[in-house]
């Protein structure tokens, strides 16, 4: 054999006895008839030698160390060569060592070509016998980053100040390339960064530096995980120890792109996050240890990357191609913001782009899927605009306000479906006619259905909320003067079953001056509760609202107000109420800012209740609640 090392190679080759075996016959290195058991060849030297036995691989090992000095000159970055070529070396178990020394401010990055690396723990070995041992340096102290086999996920390791990489090849292994390159990076300001890339499903077990010994005091180590957006990652700690901290706290930090609370800070004993979609970083931060009894910080953990479970594997088609002026947003339902990590919950478009919020617009067919352990964490909000620009074309036109079935079939709860109904100013008004008569939600008689309609003005400057209405009441229709939004809001998952009860028709009708008119047809023996719009905030200034209350021929209606006085104090104008019998046109007028409210009154025929507000002083608003009860006429009411 001849080993010739160029002067500029900075390589030293050492052939020495390996682990002693119980072989009877000793073996020697023979150089010009001299028998030796160790041979050192430095760069710029050439040595010719032989072995005194047939199977030197059973006796000797060879170490090839290349020193790379990035302190005094430029660093030879790029693909690292196996030098001398393995074909020129004796067939012994060989270890190639690259020792790179650099300034503290220089970041060094080892880049591993495919196959990437898989970290192994103490006592483990690599199936093919090829191992990569990587060390870093903190001042004069060597820090073991880890031992790795082939066929894993580790693609890059970044360090600073220096790196020592040892590649061990068994004597029979044909490998003739190092499989890695070195690049320079800016300072990473930590011990190291390990990048782990998942192409698909899989798992990786990783360990803190020096494992199973202690992680260096007050150091920081980061793992960067690259995970396809359609897969989910979960972290579990297999083994950890905490040291005795004098200052600071040992912790792990997660950085999740898109998270509002980065970094997410965890104790090592906490349950670690699962179900994360896409890339994330995990950092281990040590503390200042107690000098007398430091203890050790160490961590061994597993990252499991897999396809999401159950619902999340399905693809849902949301066909909005025939819709106009509509947008559907799937988003996280609000929760109290906690510093605790909550696994990611994402919605994906075409199974590719996943995010916590997704808005779908009308005019297209969309394919979506979910990456979420618990779909109740998401909800849907839909907005649709129905507008009339030409009053001659729209008059008497009707539209059905119904949630499309495509949306109802999604596994995410519908929160709000809002219809914005727009009319030309002072030209047209609107009438809402429900499929099933509506009940107004009041404290006295709350809605207990799975959904309600929230009706409010859609004029930006006007703060007018007509109220919340649910099926199963006496309100036959609601007429409104101008632009409104009608929001179907769900309150329970059972809405899916009750969806058939939804149904509201809007028609464009000739313009009228009153803000709103409620047509009420009470049912016998049920008490109908009605209240003025903007309950709790007061009817807006100079607003007029009416209730058209039908009384069947054989019934008597009892109209009851729930307070003695309205409580309104007018700054300008007058607030009044008119109760008018429809048949006789007889009316009673009450000054709401002066008079007491009427005692319960009985009406044998349909009647109007009209309430008009003044400009009240602040804090003295107009809020009225009244009820209508029908009883048969035969009963003696005295």
């Amino acid at each position: 054999f001849e080993i010739a090392l160029p002067r500029e190679s900075n390589i030293t080759v050492l052939i020495k006895l390996g682990t002693p075996t119980l072989l009877a016959k000793p073996c020697y290195i023979v150089i010009s008839k001299r028998h030796i058991t160790m041979l050192s060849i430095k760069s710029g030297e050439r040595i010719v030698f032989t072995f005194s036995c047939q199977s030197p691989e059973n006796h000797f090992v060879i170490e090839i160390q290349k020193n790379i000095d990035c302190m005094s000159g430029p660093c030879p970055f790029g693909e690292v060569q196996l030098q001398p070529s393995t074909s020129l070396l004796p067939t012994l178990n060989r270890t190639f060592i690259w020792d790179v020394k650099a300034h503290k401010s220089i970041g060094l990055e080892l880049q591993f070509s495919i196959p990437r690396l898989r970290q192994i723990g103490p006592g483990e070995s690599c199936p093919d016998g090829v191992t990569h041992s990587i060390s870093g340096r903190i001042d004069a102290t060597v820090v073991r980053i880890g031992t790795f086999c082939s066929n894993g996920t580790v693609s890059r390791i970044k360090m600073q100040e220096g790196v020592k990489m040892a590649l061990h090849l068994p004597w029979f292994h044909p490998r003739n390339v190092s499989g890695f390159s070195i690049a320079n990076r800016s300072s990473i300001k930590r011990l190291c960064i390990i990048e782990s890339v998942f192409e698909g499903e899989g798992s990786a077990t990783l360990m803190s530096a020096n494992y199973p010994e202690g992680f260096p005091e007050d150091e920081l180590m980061t793992w960067q995980f690259v995970v396809p957006a359609h897969l989910r990652a979960s972290v579990s700690f297999l083994n950890f120890n905490l040291s005795n901290c004098e200052r600071k706290e040992e912790r792990v930090e997660y950085y999740i792109p898109g998270s509002t609370t980065n970094p997410e800070v965890f104790k090592l004993e906490d349950k670690q996050p699962g179900n994360m979609a896409g890339n994330f970083n995990l950092s281990l931060q040590g503390c200042d240890q107690d000098a007398q009894s430091p203890g050790i910080l160490r961590l061994q953990f597993q990252v499991l990357v897999q396809h999401p479970q159950n619902e999340s594997n399905k693809i849902y088609v949301v066909d909005l191609s025939n819709e106009r002026a509509m947008s559907l947003t799937i988003e996280p339902r609000p929760v109290k913001q906690s510093r605790k990590f909550v696994p990611g919950c994402f919605v994906c478009l075409e199974s590719r782009t996943c995010s916590s919020n997704l808005t779908l617009t009308s005019g297209s067919k969309h394919k979506i899927s979910f990456l979420c352990d618990d779909l109740t964490r998401l909800w849907m909000n839909v907005e649709k605009t129905i507008s009339c620009t030409d009053h001659r074309y729209c008059q008497r036109k009707s539209y059905s306000l119904q949630v499309p079935s495509d949306i109802l079939h999604l596994p995410v709860e519908l929160h709000d479906f809002s219809w914005k109904l727009l009319v030309p100013k002072d030209r047209l008004s609107l009438v809402l006619v429900p499929a099933q008569k509506l009940q107004q939600h009041t404290h006295e008689k709350p809605c207990n259905t799975s959904f309600s309609y929230l009706v409010a003005s859609a004029i930006p400057s006007q703060d007018l909320y007509f109220g919340s209405f649910c099926p199963g009441g006496s309100i036959k229709q609601i007429q409104v003067k101008q632009n409104i939004s009608v929001t179907l809001r769900t309150f329970a998952p059972s809405f899916q079953q009750e969806a058939s009860r939804q149904g509201l028709t809007v028609s464009f009708i000739p313009y009228f001056k009153e803000e709103g008119v409620f047509t009420v047809t009470p049912d016998t023996k049920s008490k109908v509760y009605l209240r003025t719009p903007n309950w709790d905030r007061g009817l807006p200034s100079l607003t007029s609202v009416s209730w058209n209350i039908s009384v069947p021929r054989d019934q008597v209606a009892c109209l009851t107000f729930f307070k003695e006085r309205s409580g309104v104090v007018c700054q300008t104008g007058r607030a009044f109420m008119i109760i008018q019998e429809q048949r006789t046109r007889a009316e009673e007028i009450f000054s709401l800012d002066e008079d007491v409210l009427p005692k319960p009154s009985f009406h044998h025929h349909s009647f109007w209740v009209n309430i008009s507000n003044c400009s009240p002083t602040s804090g003295k608003q107009l809020d009225l609640l009244f009820s209508v009860t029908l009883t048969p006429r035969t009963v003696d009411l005295t």
């Epitope: 010739a4 160029p6 002067r7 500029e8 430095k42 760069s43 710029g44 030297e45 050439r46 020129l88």
Partner: antibody, heavy 120, light 112 residues
């Protein structure tokens, strides 16, 4: 006796490649030695350019690294210099030389040199 | 790159005199293997350079013993004990310890 002879065009146009051949007699280029190219500029300044060793290892002057290539043809016992994208600054006398790399460590044997002018 | 500074630039001597040429380096020329690859060459007019001394002080085969090399730290000296007419020409020092290998600027030995 080891003898080296350089050959190649004496005139090269700027931006073109310069190619020189060194024919070695009296010694096999695969037996030993490092086979160098060295040039001498007008004014006598000498510059080591690079070498190819008997076992195919190459080493180049970093100032030329992106432009230089030293190769060999063992069947003809020749080694070659290729210098790309030449400029008038590459006008020089080019020597090929053999050195007992692992012995003297020096450049022991030199060719007589060939003058190359870079001009349009 | 290692810069080798030779002095003097020109050295006029009489035949039979002793001549001394200096070569100075700012950095050590000791290689990690312990060798110092510092050589001396003579280039006679119209000829290629010829090796005289290698590894600081070892004479190349066929070089007369009036040529000697020595060192003091990073200062290297070539001495010719009795100059003969055939010794005239330009003397170059050369280092092969660190890539790029470099030559000194040369010292011209001429007759007074």
């Amino acid at each position: 006796e080891v003898k080296l002879v350089e050959s190649g065009p004496g005139l090269v146009k700027p931006s073109q490649s310069l190619s020189l051949t060194c024919t070695v007699t009296g010694y096999s280029i695969t037996s030993d030695y490092a086979w160098n190219w060295i040039r001498q500029f007008p004014g006598n300044k000498l510059e080591w350019m690079g070498y190819i060793s008997y076992n195919t290892y190459t080493s180049y002057n970093p100032s030329l690294k992106s432009r230089i290539s030293v190769t060999r043809d063992t069947s003809k016992n020749q080694f070659f210099l290729q210098l790309k994208s030449v400029t008038i600054e590459d006008t020089a006398t080019y020597f090929c030389a053999g050195g007992d790399y692992y012995g003297t460590g020096a450049v022991d044997y030199w060719g007589q040199g060939t003058t190359v002018t870079v001009s349009s | 790159e290692i810069v080798l500074t030779q002095s003097p630039l020109s050295l006029p001597v009489s035949l039979g005199d002793q001549a001394s040429i200096s070569c100075r380096s700012r950095q050590t020329l000791v290689h990690t293997n312990g060798n110092t690859y510092l050589d001396w060459y003579l280039q006679k007019p119209g000829q290629s350079p010829k090796l005289l001394i290698y590894k600081v002080s070892i004479r190349f085969s066929g070089v007369p013993d009036r040529f000697s090399g020595s060192r003091s730290g990073t200062d290297f000296t070539l001495k010719i004990s009795r100059v003969e007419a055939e010794d005239l020409g330009i003397y170059y020092c050369f280092q092969g310890s660190h890539v790029p290998w470099t030559f000194g600027g040369g010292t011209k030995l001429e007759i007074k």
